[in-house]
């Protein structure tokens, strides 16, 4: 574990003076209400801050907004409220920032009840100027930018109209009525569900899934009897009401809805749900809820077609009531995911997978840590990390686990060491190898963030009392130094750094409270002088990811290949820099049976790596059918795991079997397949804002 404050640590010299010279305070001339902050563009230094103070009156909401802009990462702010004509901005829509570096911003204004439509303020120059535009409708949702072209916007109206703008919100056209949900697909495609009877809430399960590829000139109904739909990676999913009408099944398309296949997943009843936990162009993690109010379900992982699924994890915690799951993609190391299971004794336990859901294991506890009171055996226990479920249940957990793709191997999380997640005060744990090993880095709950691609970690203690101290580490959480950033403590509300973890700046947000007033205040600290030199070749060392046993020649092989990274030495105090690119090199592994999943019609008996044929498909628990092309109906029993790059070694070829005669389905009949069909789950932008923080891809 990390050396304590008194132990010999690689101290950064003269850091107090260096940080004091780079600490910038800004007091906002506002009554304290709510504050929201957005970065505009990447590496631009532009931050927009919207403060709102509103008093709900019986008839209407009286409020005041102020808009501030910084172009130096938050060191200085300018009040630009006059650019939006001192208008009250609706905070529930936030600030809609355009994709990539488009510099586009849309703010949605609060308008009086009798007005014909809403009002937006648009900027396409990183919020230097805004144009006021009156809308011909009242928006129900935030404006959705097309990922391919930020001039194209999509919005739903309060009357369920689907509106499109092709000139960045200057002119709007209603392209369809009675729309329940709309999403941008690939290449400018728009998918939406519509109910021609007019109601979205009562008739779920009777919706049509439609598609337009020309922004509303023409439409194609790609599936019927839809309960919900989503997009994830290359997959379009729909959950479809079955013939019996009480069950739903997942259908999947990889050609934008032209053709569909039924996913080999159990159908669910009205009290259950499907949820796509993660998806990319290669595979899908799908949660299928158990019947009843169990609070758990099963995770399945798909093949590359999104149709054949293997059971990955049973008793996966996913509350039916609030929709919380602890499922997290550890983005700092390929193939790593963590989540929680609900044990038979109703305790919540953390598990981790290092191979994209192939196997789940408990998290190894730090070497020198003691097991807490939840442990039956004081010597044998594991680390349990807090995520969305802990936060939802009101535990003292201020943040979800944190990892960044450019801070290789680094994971920060709150946790406890025992047999299950503890309700006691958590500590902060850090892993530098993607979750294989952990150290206890900080006592008690903290807010934390990663700067300079992992070169610095900053943390602030979570406290109900005013604070004036931050902690920082330049060696991936082993040693910490403290810095008093102000003489006058503030009530802390948030830690903000530019998304992407490339910045050297951190902003501490809070408010000061005096006898009569309270004011927003921010402190922005630039760490550039702490890391005074640029990192050189000698500052980096090779690291083989997923290495657990160097004597094994296949050590580090995950999904058919090893990856070697160049990583910053813990002893090096230097800047990776904003342009830092992770240096990694792959090395292909020999194939083994573990590199293959069982194809449709085959399964793996327990404790066996071979796929054997299912004796009886008809009426099987997991019904599945592939229609159309002949080659879809032949199999050799094995299919390479999505993303697996192994070569040579085991090549499990069997004679090709034609499964046409064995394949049955109650849900769809072949003749309907190409005209109308049904889908399942999927993509970015969930149906429920609860999932935004965790990036849950889709929840019915």
């Amino acid at each position: 574990s990390a050396p304590g404050e008194d132990e010999e640590c690689g101290r950064v010299r003269d850091f107090v003076a260096k940080l004091a010279n780079n600490t910038h305070q800004h007091v906002f001339d506002d009554l304290r209400g709510s504050v929201s902050l957005s970065w505009v563009g990447d590496s631009t230094g532009v931050i927009l801050v919207l403060t709102t103070f509103h008093v709900p009156l019986v008839i209407m909401t009286f409020g005041q907004s102020k808009l501030y802009r910084s172009e130096d990462y938050g060191k200085n702010f300018k009040d630009i409220t006059d650019l939006i004509n001192n208008t009250f901005i609706r905070t529930e829509f936030g600030m809609a920032i355009g994709p990539e570096n488009s510099g586009k911003v849309v703010l949605t204004a609060e308008v009086s009840g009798g007005s014909r439509g809403g009002r937006i303020f648009r900027s396409s120059d990183f919020a230097k100027n805004f144009v006021q535009t009156d809308l011909p409708f009242h928006p129900l949702t935030q404006m959705m930018y097309s990922p391919q072209n930020s001039d194209y916007l999509l919005a739903l109206s309060t009357e369920n109209g689907l509106w499109v703008s092709k000139n960045f919100g200057g002119k709007w056209e209603e392209i369809h009525k009675t729309v329940c949900l709309a999403k941008w697909g690939r290449k400018g495609t728009i998918f939406f569900t519509a109910n021609h009877n007019g109601s979205c809430s009562n008739d779920r399960g009777m919706l049509e899934l439609e598609r337009t590829t020309d922004y509303g000139k023409s439409f194609k109904t790609v599936a019927s009897k839809i309960y919900s739909f989503g997009l994830g990676g290359k997959f379009l999913f729909a959950s479809v009401m079955t013939g019996k009408g009480t069950l739903r099944a997942i259908h999947v398309s990889v050609d934008d809805g032209d053709t569909w296949n039924m996913a080999q997943l159990p159908p669910v009843g009205h009290e259950q749900f499907y949820s796509i936990l993660a998806a990319n162009d290669e595979m899908v993690f799908m949660h299928v809820d158990e019947p009843g109010d169990s609070g758990f379900g099963t995770i399945y992982v798909s093949d590359d077609r999104g149709t054949v699924y293997s059971k990955s994890l049973e008793r996966h915690l996913y509350t039916t009531t609030g929709g919380e799951t602890d499922f997290i993609n550890v983005t700092s190391l390929r193939g790593v995911f963590t989540t929680s299971i609900l044990a038979e004794d109703k305790s919540v336990q953390s598990v981790i997978s290092f191979d994209q859901g192939g196997e789940w294991v408990p998290l190894r506890k730090p070497a020198d840590s003691k097991c807490d009171a939840t442990a039956r055996d004081p010597e044998k226990c594991s680390l349990h990390i807090h995520a969305a479920y802990s936060i939802a249940t009101g535990l003292n957990v201020p943040m979800l686990p944190l990892s960044e793709p450019n801070a290789v191997g680094l994971v920060l999380a709150h946790g406890s060491v025992g047999d299950a997640i503890s309700v006691m005060r958590p500590d902060v744990y850090v892993s530098d190898d993607g979750g294989y090993t952990w150290i206890k880095a900080l006592e008690g709950p903290h807010y934390y963030t990663i700067l300079d691609s992992g070169g610095i970690i900053v943390a602030i203690e979570h406290s109900s009392r005013p604070i004036n101290v931050i902690k920082f580490s330049t060696d991936e959480g082993q040693c910490w130094q403290t810095y008093t950033f102000t003489r006058d403590p503030i009530y802390f509300t948030g830690l903000a750094s530019e998304p992407g973890a490339r910045s050297m700046n951190i902003s501490i947000w809070g408010f000061t409270e005096s006898f009569l007033t309270s004011q927003w205040v921010s402190y922005t600290i630039d760490f550039k002088d702490i890391l005074e030199r640029n990192c050189e070749e000698k500052d980096y060392t090779i690291w083989l990811a997923h290495s657990t046993d160097p004597e094994d020649y296949e050590d580090g092989c995950i999904l058919g290949y090893k990856e070697q990274f160049l990583r910053l030495r813990k002893s090096s105090v230097c800047q990776n820099g904003r342009d830092y690119v992770v240096t990694k090199q792959p090395s292909i592994c020999l194939c083994s049976l573990e590199d293959f999943l069982c194809d449709f019609g085959y399964y793996r008996p327990e404790n066996d790596s071979k796929c054997v044929e299912q004796p009886e498909l008809k009426g099987h628990d997991l019904e599945f059918c592939l229609y159309g092309r002949e080659e879809h109906l032949t199999t050799n029993g094995y299919r390479k795991i999505p993303g697996d790059k192994c070569q040579g070694g085991v090549n499990p070829v069997r004679e090709v079997k034609d499964l046409k005669k064995k394949c049955t389905s109650n849900f769809l009949s072949p003749e309907k397949q190409n005209s109308k069909s049904n889908g399942s789950a999927g993509g970015s932008g969930g149906l429920n804002d609860i999932f935004e923080a965790q990036k849950i891809e889709w929840h019915e």
Epitope: I542, D555, Q564, P586, S587, G648
Partner: antibody
Framework: EVQLVESGGGLVKPGGSLRLSCAAS????????MNWVRQAPGKGLEWVSS????????YYADSVKGRFTISRDNAKNSLYLQMNSLRAEDTAVYYC?????????????????WGQGTMVTVSS | ARQLTQSPSSLSASVGDRVTITCRAS??????LAWYQQKPGKVPKLLIY???SLESGVPSRFSGSGSGTDFTLTISSLQPEDFATYYC??????????FGQGTKLEII
């Protein structure tokens, strides 16, 4: 002094068997992967076989697979190579070599200590 | 096909020369490469491991570089005792632990 000493080489007829031994001293033998490498007269080095510290992982070159068996006795600080069905092309100096391995993830190691070699001649 | 190809197979040089020997892998092997020196009738001696790390006790005129598929061993200023055969060996590809065919460094 860290040392590896091979023994057991000699002249053997094609189809015959031979057992090579390697005695280790001066280091904790049970902590290291061990290897056999051979060198035919006037030729280059050829890796033959490898065994991990606790014998969990055993690897062979394709040219000897099914004919040679590597083993070790950590209590005796000894490494062995049982060679069956010997062929003329197995004629070589056989070296015993230690593989030094870094901590997990931090490097790939190398054959840092070599024995002086023992000559195996397969001829009728 | 051979996993590792060394070039040149032989090389003549003079004392004080800077000499470079290359080793090419048929597939990426990250930094999992070592270099050895063998003198006639002697045992191979480790020079470089992990592609660029100098083995303890080896003179600093020896250096290694490269990663992925292309690697080099450089002797910055040849000494009389450096005339020998040099082998590269990989620890991350197939066939396992395979050696290059060797480069014989001779005196002019």
């Amino acid at each position: 002094e860290v040392q590896l000493v091979e023994s057991g080489g000699g002249l053997v007829k094609p189809g015959g068997s031979l057992r090579l031994s390697c005695a280790a001293s001066g280091f904790t033998f049970s902590s290291y992967s061990m290897n056999w490498v051979r060198q035919a007269p006037g030729k280059g080095l050829e890796w033959v076989s490898s065994i991990s510290s606790s014998s969990s992982y055993i690897y062979y070159a394709d040219s000897v697979k099914g004919r040679f068996t590597i083993s070790r006795d950590n209590a005796k600080n000894s490494l062995y190579l049982q060679m069956n069905s010997l062929r003329a092309e197995d004629t070589a100096v056989y070296y015993c070599a230690r593989r030094r391995i870094a901590a997990a993830g931090t490097g790939y190691g190398a054959f840092d200590i070599w024995g002086q070699g023992t000559m195996v001649t397969v001829s009728s | 096909a051979r996993q590792l190809t060394q070039s040149p197979s032989s090389l003549s040089a003079s004392v004080g020369d800077r000499v470079t020997i290359t080793c090419r892998a048929s597939q990426g092997i990250t930094s999992a490469l070592a270099w050895y020196q063998q003198k006639p009738g002697k045992v191979p001696k480790l020079l470089i491991y992990d592609a660029s790390s100098l083995e303890s006790g080896v003179p600093s005129r020896f250096s290694g570089s490269g990663s992925g598929t292309d690697f080099t061993l450089t002797i910055s200023s040849l000494q009389p005792e450096d005339f020998a055969t040099y082998y590269c060996q990989q620890f991350n590809g197939y066939p396992m632990f395979s050696f290059g065919q060797g480069t014989k460094l001779e005196i002019i």
